[in-house]
């Protein structure tokens, strides 16, 4: 029997019946096998046909075999009912391999002439299957020519038998509190041959809780226990299952902070699986009762591990942990069901006992020693030597700690002496005048250093005085021996102040004329005001209407007097204000060079003589009353005058304090 | 004035409970903590932990949890400490004290003796 | 747990003399809101203890002057100007800043 070509040989040709295209002989058998190569199929048609027609052709065939499979067996020329000749179709092997036989018996009534056929070897595509059969790949098919291959789609792995996917479903691992886990691709039909491992991982002291929900379909057996697919629980105390079977499994409490779930398939079924919705408990902290004026927040119905709540406490109370304050308050609960942290306590605000105010008191409003949370405090100044600047005085404890005022400052009201109070009301003389009483000058200054000097007292711890008077210890400000309330030039009885610093006007230019002769002392405590020490009025801006020509200004010192000595006694004359341009002519002629008195200065004294002040008196205070606000303020400086004092036609001069009320409030406000 | 008076001296077997009072007077007891501090014979002293009455929250040292447990009876004014399981080593002197914003410790109560012994 | 250590542990002091006892914690007792929370108590023999000072220095009402604390940090120190009969005992510091709350080893101030 003839063999066609065998493979890798180009597999096409032609077959034909013996001696065609004439008749063929009786008795003849001829048999042709074709083999294609792997993954192809044989393709084979007729172009002739022509055999002798039996019942069932059983006379003389054509019989086409693929295998053990016969795929037709052909005689006539046309098909009838019960026999089949090939016409127009084509015939296809079922493998690689199709084996064709041609026969004829011993007789034919007339003559056949055969048959003459075609055939080709072609790609076969596996990827394509008849309705109802199994698909050659589970997910994706790719066909070749001479073959196929299979993939999967994402999360599966090609199985080794090359056709399934097999899910990539192990190694997730749960960390949350509660959540959900399921067969792949449920509800639809779980994969084929997998194997899934799911682990619930929780923090020690939570305990993993296990519900079946929606439905549950897994592969099962009726006399056999889950032997294809099954789904098993484990956690380190026991194990749960295997399940499979159509039966929802009942709630797994499983005592364990870790679970893991497997779940095995093989290859065959078509089940759609399950679905699990785990939550977890653990020992519950007992239920935190708020302290009284405070709230819990969040409210729960319980509280397990890692639960946490706060405490808030209502405006005026604050929290504190027994002694400790605290900025916040968080309390988690633990493995063993105790809070982390001890409850607080709401506790009322108490701003504490409130400072004491200098040359003030307090007074406590609401009751004796009541600090607490809306508490009213009223502080006031000594009366008569201080007032009270800004502030009412009134305070109250608020919400924050800290005593604050009706305007919502937290710092100390002040108490400012009252400034220009004198026991005096007429006048007298120094140079020419008349011993002062106790409390006629309060503001009077002794200034020891190197020479006997004066000033006046600002505020409670400045002194104003002539910058040269105490230019020699601008740099030595402690070497200044300052001496206030008292009378006696000479009395130990005294209230001694000491320098911090000397502030000399920058204007201020020594041994050459007296322009600008104006200084600040700061003392570096501030001095206790009384009826002998008691600070004068600057200028107020409409005080110039009190110093014009002819007003009367008082000087006070324990300068030279007419015998030529300093006085024992402090002294103080009345003297009047002389017009300027007077002033200026007066000190034009020699030995006083031109331009000696200047617009910063002021002259006082009388034509005639007599009253002046005198060297010892410098740095002291003219001062002059202010009858709106009946307080004395200073209006000048004792600064220079004529040799002689006293002299008639010469006048006392005075640095002009107005012309520098910014440059002391500057340095007041700086230092 | 505050005053905390503790009840009378306790002998006790090994393993038994004891419980221990501290009767407060003199203020307002929900609103101060009453500390516990155990002071074994001739030793030093050892904080216990702390009740606050007002919200009944307890708060205890790590080293005494499980041994001591406190509890006030609001309507007496009384602190309690529950001593179990008791040993030789909780033989001691057990003294309450009350606290206010300066600290926990600025009045005591005149201590209870307890002694375990069989 | 913050340890106290207290020196010396027995001080003998002649009476009208001075008297220094130091504490030494093993972190620093200063709290978020500035304050430090140590205290000095004395117990004298058979008594319950008596707090002395607050907050490093401040004495509690009744406390003679003679008393003084200091220090800050980690590092305290409790001063008797002049030793009286009735000082006699055991002293303890304790911090109060931390939980749990420590007390000091005591050091025990006799008469010479």
């Known amino acids: 029997t003839p063999l066609g070509p065998k493979w890798p040989e180009p597999v096409f040709g032609r077959l034909a019946s013996p001696g065609f295209p004439g008749e063929y002989a009786n008795d003849q058998e001829r048999r042709w096998t074709l083999t294609a190569p792997p993954g192809y199929r044989l393709r084979l048609y007729f172009t002739h046909f022509d055999l002798e027609l039996s019942h069932l052709c059983e006379y003389d065939f054509v019989k086409l075999s693929s295998g053990a499979k016969v795929l037709a067996t052909l005689c006539g020329q046309e098909s009838t009912d019960t026999e089949r000749a090939p016409g127009k179709d084509t015939f296809y092997s079922l493998g690689s391999s199709l084996d064709i036989t041609f026969r004829s018996d011993y007789s034919n009534e007339k003559p056949f002439t055969g048959f003459e056929a075609f055939y080709a070897a072609e790609d076969i595509d596996e990827c394509q299957v008849a309705p109802g059969e199994a698909p050659t790949c589970d997910h994706h098919c790719h066909n070749h020519l001479g073959g196929f291959y299979c993939s999967c789609r994402a999360g599966y792995v090609l199985h080794r038998n090359k056709r399934t996917c097999s899910a990539l479903c192990s190694g997730q691992v749960f960390t949350q509190r509660s959540g959900e886990l399921s067969s792949p691709e449920y509800p639809r039909p779980y994969p084929k041959l997998s194997s899934c491992t799911y682990s619930i991982s929780l923090e020690e002291g939570f305990s993993v809780i296990l519900d079946f929900v929606e439905s549950f379909d897994v592969e099962t057996h009726p006399e056999t226990l889950c032997p294809y697919d099954f789904l098993k629980i484990q956690t380190d105390r026991e194990e749960h299952g295997p399940f499979c079977g159509k039966t929802l499994p009942h709630r797994i409490e499983t005592k364990s902070n870790t679970v893991t779930i497997t779940f095995v398939t093989d290859e065959s079924g078509d089940h759609t699986g399950w679905k699990i919705h785990y939550t977890s408990t653990a020992q519950p902290c007992p239920y935190p009762m708020a302290p009284p004026n405070g709230h819990v927040s969040p409210v729960q119905a319980k509280y397990i591990l890692k639960d946490s709540f706060s405490i808030f406490c209502e405006t005026g109370y604050e929290l504190l942990q027994g002694h400790l304050p605290l900025k916040s308050f968080t309390a988690v609960c633990q493995k063993d069901g105790s809070w982390d942290r001890p409850m607080p306590a709401c506790s009322i605000v108490d701003c504490g006992p409130p400072d004491d105010l200098p040359s003030g008191r307090v007074e406590y409003i609401t009751g004796p020693g009541v600090t607490t949370y809306k508490a009213v405090i009223q502080y006031s100044c000594e009366e008569t030597f201080y007032t009270m600047k800004v502030n009412d005085g009134k305070y109250v404890c608020e919400a924050d700690g800290f005593w604050t005022s009706s305007k919502g400052e937290k710092s100390l009201p002040v108490c400012e002496p009252v400034c220009g109070l004198s026991a005096r009301t007429t006048g007298g003389r120094i140079y020419g005048g008349q011993k002062a009483k106790p409390g006629d000058f309060p503001w009077q200054v002794l200034i020891l250093g190197g020479t006997t000097a004066a000033g006046a007292l600002l505020y409670d711890n400045w002194v104003l005085t002539a910058a040269h008077a105490v230019y020699e210890q601008k740099h030595d400000a402690s070497a200044l021996d300052i001496r206030m309330g008292t009378l006696k030039r000479l009395s130990p009885h005294y209230t001694q102040a000491w320098s911090e610093a000397v502030f000399i006007h920058e204007g201020y230019t020594h041994d050459a004329g007296f322009d600008n002769d104006i200084a600040l002392i700061k003392l570096n405590n501030k001095v206790v005001i009384n009826s002998n020490i008691t600070p004068i009025c600057l200028p107020r801006k409409e005080a110039e209407s009190f110093m014009r020509t002819d007003d009367i200004g008082t000087a006070s010192g324990w300068g030279l007097t007419q015998r030529g000595f300093l006085a024992r006694n402090l002294m103080y004359v009345d003297i009047p204000i002389v017009d300027h341009q007077k002033c200026t002519a007066a000190y034009e002629k020699p030995p006083y060079p031109r331009g000696s008195v200047t617009a910063n200065m002021l002259c006082a004294g009388l034509e005639s003589g007599g009253k002046d002040s005198c060297r010892g008196d410098s740095g002291g205070a003219l001062v002059f009353l202010d009858s709106e606000t009946e307080r004395w303020f200073v209006g000048g400086i004792v600064s220079w005058g004529s040799m002689n004092c006293g002299e008639a036609g010469q006048y006392g001069v005075y640095t002009k304090v107005i012309n520098y009320i910014p440059w002391i409030e500057n340095i007041i406000s700086d230092f | 004035q505050v005053q905390l008076q503790q009840s009378g001296p306790e002998l006790v077997k090994p393993g038994a409970s004891v419980k221990i009072s501290c009767k407060a007077s003199g203020y307002t007891f929900t609103d101060y903590y009453i500390n516990w501090v155990k002071q074994r014979p001739g030793q030093g002293l050892e904080w216990v932990g702390w009740i606050f009455p007002g919200s009944d929250s307890a708060y205890y040292n790590e080293k005494f949890k499980g041994k001591a447990t406190l509890t006030v009876d609001t309507s007496s004014s009384t602190a309690y400490m529950l001593l179990s399981s008791l040993t030789s080593e909780d033989s001691a002197v057990y003294f309450c004290a009350r606290g206010d914003r300066s600290g926990p410790f600025p009045y005591w109560g005149q201590g209870t003796l307890v002694t375990v012994s069989a | 747990d913050v340890v106290m250590t207290q020196t010396p542990l027995t001080l003998s002091v002649t009476i009208g003399q001075p008297a220094s006892i130091s504490c030494k914690s093993s972190?620093?007792?200063?709290?978020?809101?500035?304050?430090?929370?140590l205290n000095w108590l004395l117990q004298r023999p058979g008594q319950s203890p008596k707090r002395l000072i607050y907050l490093v220095s401040k004495l509690d009402s009744g406390v003679p002057d003679r008393f003084t604390g200091s220090g800050s940090g980690a590092d305290f120190t409790l001063k008797i100007s002049r030793v009286e009969a009735e000082d006699l005992g055991v002293y303890y510091c304790v911090q109060v800043t931390h939980f749990p709350f420590t007390f000091g080893t005591g050091t025990k101030l006799e008469i010479k």
């Open positions: 972190q620093s007792l200063l709290y978020s809101n500035g304050k430090t929370y």
